[in-house]
Each structure stands twice: as C-alpha cells, then as structure tokens.
C-alpha cells in the first residue's frame, strides 16, 4: 500500500551510492540547453551623443549544451549526513539549434568602460581612465562576437591600465574548466525531509552579499526537492547565477509525458519592491538607482561580481517597474516566454522539466570625467542578453519513471 511506496521512495531519494536519485544526481540524465538572445544596440551614437533611449533588437537563440559534466569531488560525511561536491561548468555550442555562429557580431555596451567607471568613482582615477579609454580608441559601445561576449576577450582599454587588473572581460568569463561550489547538501539518510537541501555553500551558511535574511542560503539547488511535495508549499532554492535564494509557488497541474507534475513558478512578488513586499527590503542595496527602493524587477548583484555593476532581471524586464524599461526601446515582456518555472514530480520531488530564464544587465552612468559617458543625462540599466536554460526528462527516462514510480501509485 501507500506506506510501502512511501518507504521505497524515501529509500530511493536518499543521495547515496546505489539509489535512483544518486545516479541521476551525480550526472543528470536530462539534456540541458542554455539559449541566449543578445540585445543588439541599433543606435549607439545617438545614445552616446544625445542620451537617447537605447534601441535594442534581440538576436537568437544561440544554443549551448550545458550541465553535461558529472559532479566532482563527491564526498559523503556520515557524521552530519551530508554530501559535498563541485558542479563543473561546461558549454558546447550547438549550431543546429542556433540562428548563427559564435562568430556573429553584436553592438553592445562596452563592459569594461561601464564597469571601470562605476568601480572607480574617484574623479582623478576617472580622468586617468578617460585618457586610457581614448588611447585605446574604446567607446561607450563596442562590437563583439558572441564567443567574445560570453566567454571572454582581452579588453584594449584595460590592457593599458598601469596597475593590476583583470584584462579579460566576458559575461561568463571564466566558465569552461571552472566549477561552482563547494556545495554541501543533506543526503537525507537521517531525515528525508532535508534531502538535497543545502547546508553550506563555499563553506558558509550565508552569502555575505546581502543584509539580514536575504543573505541566507535556503532550500535546494532546484534540481530536486524533498519528496512528497504539496501544492501549498513554497519551494525555496538557491541560485548561484543570481547570487541569492529565491522561491517558487504552485501554479498548475501539468502532464509531462504521462507523468503528473506540479508546475511551480517564480511569482512577481519575488521581484517586487519593499513597498509591495517588505521581505525584499534587504535586496535593495542602494537608494539612488532604486529610487529610494521603489523600483522593482532588477537585482543589483554588484557585491557578488567584484563591484561590477551587474543587474539581474527577468527577460525583457518582465515584472520590472516602468522606470527601469523606460530608457530602453524594443522590449516586449510576456509571461509565457520570459518567466521561470519548475515542473516537479511531487512524490519524488524531482524536477523533471524546467525553464530558468534571466537577463543580464549592466548599469552605465554619466561621468563628468569620462568623455564617452559625458553626454549622458541619465542612468541606464542596459540589457546585454537574456537566457533560457531548459531541461526535460527524456522519453526513456520518462517510461522508466512511469513504470517505477507513478505507475505503481496509480
């Protein structure tokens, strides 16, 4: 009966050698793809000279296969019932799933100019930077290939800086041959309701990026959740991509390849300003750009990015306040395409399908002492790209799942 099934499930979702969960956990059996859409700036000169609205045109998808590498340094700790690991990063370009090649060119914000002018706000240093920007013939915008933009390029301006700085710039640099973690998660041996929940990340229970509860590492990594998921639950998870924990709420029942799953979505409330959602007060880290914490839908993660003014949002500024998207023309947010969801099989807690969507933006501000930013009359949170990372259980795995799990129950 039900108790026997519960007992079997509890046994099989433990993260230890020999269980179904462990095998799929170490190396995902699902093919995961990350699609990128780049925001190609159509009017760079007008923006730089007249502080016009930035006209963007998205180009994509450019697709990469990701998360194909097995977890590394997997170490069980019998004493505290945890398992620690590193999640290696790797990306393989998929030409057949892309609209062009990695050599395609895009006009985008000059990442180094925007970041350096933000990090070094001292006027004397800005004057030094200005002379180097001019000397390197850099400008507010630049033309870069997809490969350069994502994975890194040697910046000509930074190469002239006479003190030690990283001269290679890229939105995901470094990526290949790096790893995320160390993660230490509960294996569920002593308490199945804690399985996959993160105990520590990089050796700490807090991130040191935020104040108060915002700094906590909550829940799992979203690949799975403790079994017997209820629709009333709020599912907490941590995403290193956005340097914070977040949550998903039940939206609807979905049938995925004959398997009944619960669709959990990231609600707009998670992106709201503290005015609407007081819990979010600690995600508001400064008063000027956020208009005294009244703006919403963008997350300043500069503290997590060595001071670089990176802002994370949903694609096309979905769920963001009008003031954020007002200086940008060409955005068309819609929930279906741009929200994040997780399809969770409720008995096992496994995420069988997901779509993680986010947008990477960079803040650029006027600067009295930097010529190429001198004519700007306002701050811009400039969209650089948005991504859609998806994974769906394969047909074979779905058959196995139906016969071994959902079939047995029904």
């Amino acid at each position: 009966g039900d108790l026997l099934i519960q007992k079997t499930i509890k046994k099989q979702v433990v993260l230890e050698e020999g269980t179904i969960a462990f095998k799929n956990w170490v190396k995902t059996g699902t093919e995961v793809y990350r699609q990128f859409w780049i925001f190609d700036v159509q009017n760079p000169q007008e923006v730089m000279m007249n502080s016009s609205n930035i006209q963007v045109k998205q180009r994509g998808p450019y697709t990469y296969r990701v998360r194909f590498l097995a977890k590394e340094n997997v170490t069980q700790d019998a004493e505290d019932n945890t398992v620690s690991f590193l999640q290696p990063n790797g990306a393989i370009f998929e030409p057949s799933l892309s609209v062009g090649t990695e050599a395609d060119n895009f006009t985008v914000l000059n990442l180094a100019v925007a970041a350096a002018s933000h990090i070094y706000q001292n006027q004397f240093v800005q004057m030094i930077l200005n002379s180097l920007i001019n000397k390197s013939k850099s400008s507010m915008f630049q033309v870069r290939t997809l490969r350069e933009l994502l994975w890194g390029y040697r910046d000509p301006f930074l190469s002239l800086v006479p003190y030690p700085v990283t001269t290679t710039v890229g939105l995901f640099y470094p990526y290949n041959n790096t790893a995320d973690g160390v993660y230490k998660v509960f294996n569920g041996k002593d308490n199945i309701s804690k399985v996959a929940i993160i105990d520590t990340y990089k050796g700490k229970r807090n991130l040191s990026y935020w104040e108060s509860h915002c700094d906590m590492i909550n829940g799992t990594d979203a690949a799975s959740f403790p079994p017997f998921v209820e629709k009333s639950q709020v599912l907490q998870f941590f995403s290193s991509d956005i340097c914070r924990s977040i949550y998903a709420v039940f939206e609807s029942d979905v049938n995925l390849k004959g398997i009944p799953v619960y669709r959990f979505v990231l609600p707009s409330k998670a992106f709201a300003s503290p005015v609407e959602n007081p819990d979010n007060y600690c995600f508001c880290t400064e008063k000027i750009i956020s208009k005294n914490c009244t703006s919403y839908g963008v997350l300043d993660i500069s503290k997590c990015k060595e001071g670089r003014p990176v802002y994370i949002s949903l694609p096309h500024f979905l769920y963001a306040s009008p003031d954020v998207s007002e200086p940008i023309d060409g955005l068309n947010p819609n929930e279906e395409e741009h929200r994040t969801y997780l399809d969770i099989e409720p008995i096992t807690g496994f995420t069988l399908q997901f779509a993680k969507r986010l947008q990477v933006n960079l803040l650029v501000k006027p600067s009295e002492k930097i010529q190429v930013l001198k004519n700007l009359k306002r701050n811009y949170i400039v969209p650089i790209l948005w991504l859609n990372e998806t994974g769906t259980i394969g047909d074979e795995k779905a058959n196995m799942f139906r016969s071994q799990v959902t079939g047995k129950i029904n």
């Epitope: 070094y120 001292n122 006027q123 004397f124 240093v125 004057m127 030094i128 200005n130 002379s131 006479p162 003190y163 009295e368």
Partner: antibody, heavy 118, light 107 residues
Framework: QIQLVQSGPELVKPGASVKISCETS????????MHWVKQSHGKSLEWIGG????????KYNQKFKGKATLTVDKSSSTAYMELRSLTSEDSAVYYC???????????WGQGTLVTVSA | ETTVTQSPASLSVATGEKVTIRCITS??????MNWYQQKPGEPPKLLIS???TLRPGVPSRFSSGGYGTDFVFTVENMLSEDVADYYC?????????FGAGTKLELK
C-alpha cells in the same frame, strides 16, 4: 579635522635626491587623491602629479616624469614625493594637496621649501 | 595639454571696488574651472570649485562664471583682507593646469 603636515625645509646639493613627506589625519587616507604642486619663488603653481592610495594609481605631469616619484604608506597615512637629480631649477616650495569628493585641492599642506645649492 | 591664460597679471583696486579676473583655456573644458586665493607665506585656499560652486565658508562677494573656454572671477566689494594672489585651475583633463596668477593689491 583634516590635517596635512609636511616635512621640514631641505637644503640639498645639485645632483642629489630628496624625499618629502606629507602626513595626513582626520580622514580615510585611501579614499582621496593626494596631489603634489610646485611653486617656484614668486611664480605660479604647477601640478606635478597625483596618487590614489586605494589602488596606487598615479599620474604625472609629463614635465615631471623622471623627476618626481609619488608613493604612499597606507599604514601611517603618509604620502611621499621623491625628487631626483636636483638642479637649481628644482628650488621651490612643494605642496601636498588632497581632494574632497569631487573637489580638487580642497586641503593643503603647509609647504616644504627645497633649496638646491652647492 | 590645456593651457590656461590668466589676465591681468596684477591689479590695484580701491576698497569697495569690483574686481574681475579672466581665464581663457585652449580647449573646451565645460565648467571645470576652479579658483584659489593665496596669501603670502600660506598655501592656496579653494574659493570656487567646478560648476561655479562657491565653497562653504567663502564670502558671497566672491563669484565666478563662464563655460567652455572663457571664465571670469569676480570680487564684488574689495576688502583689505582680499589682498592676495589668485589662481585659476582647469580640472577637465590631465595634466591639471593653473593660470599664471593675478596679484591683487590695494590702491
């Protein structure tokens, strides 16, 4: 309050070097640029260069490149300027001056008189 | 390098009179001009910073104007304590450059 106290007068021989200090107090030393300014007797002011203690970024007036070297000691909140291969042309009062946010040369040291004479 | 031409080199003015000093720059520097006062045996003192901003504690008889390449510094009612050398400084670009100075004396 903010104070910049410079080392005393120097009498040096031609061809020698001299190192002038500027000890600061009353502010976060690393956050503000320290500049050095030359004033020859009865003449105008000349900007020698500046140093941002936070990251050690320096910029010199081309005219003083090779003549002046700017350094800082963060632990003692002190800025230094070394002048080398001195000639009578280098005889002058040298000031250190500190910025305040976006204000240039908001605070000044009392000046150090350097006399180059055989 | 932006050169700064300051005039006049010296000026003799009676108490209560208006004083005007001019600085012309070789390049457009927006409003990045600063004005300093230096009394004998003392370091210079900042009176007016970029954007024609009068510094706190500086008497309102001092003012400045100008944009681009032409700048004017004014003392509205000359007092004996205003006897000093006055310098303009452009802070638009490096190297920072001063004017040659104006010696202001009492008539």
């Amino acid at each position: 309050q903010i104070q910049l106290v410079q080392s005393g007068p120097e009498l040096v021989k031609p061809g020698a070097s001299v190192k002038i200090s500027c000890e600061t107090s009353g502010h976060t030393f690393t956050e503000y640029t320290m500049h050095w300014v030359k004033q020859s007797h009865g003449k105008s002011l000349e900007w020698i260069g500046g140093i941002y203690p936070n990251n050690g970024a320096t910029k010199y007036n081309q005219k003083f490149k090779g003549k002046a070297t700017l350094t800082v000691d963060k632990s003692s909140s002190t800025a230094y300027m070394e002048l080398r291969s001195l000639t009578s042309e280098d005889s002058a009062v040298y000031y250190c001056a500190r910025d305040r946010y976006d204000v240039w040369f908001a605070y000044w040291g009392q000046g150090t008189l350097v006399t180059v004479s055989a | 390098e932006t050169t700064v031409t300051q005039s006049p080199a010296s000026l003799s003015v009676a108490t209560g009179e208006k004083v005007t000093i001019r600085c012309i720059t070789s390049t457009d520097i927006d409003d990045d001009m600063n004005w300093y006062q230096q009394k004998p045996g003392e370091p210079p003192k900042l009176l007016i910073s970029e954007g024609n901003t009068l510094r706190p504690g500086v008497p309102s008889r001092f003012s400045s104007g100008g944009y681009g390449t032409d700048f004017v510094f004014t003392v509205e009612n000359m007092l004996s304590e205003d006897v000093a050398d006055y310098y303009c400084l452009q802070s638009d670009n490096l190297p920072l450059t001063f004017g040659a100075g104006t010696k202001l004396e009492l008539k």
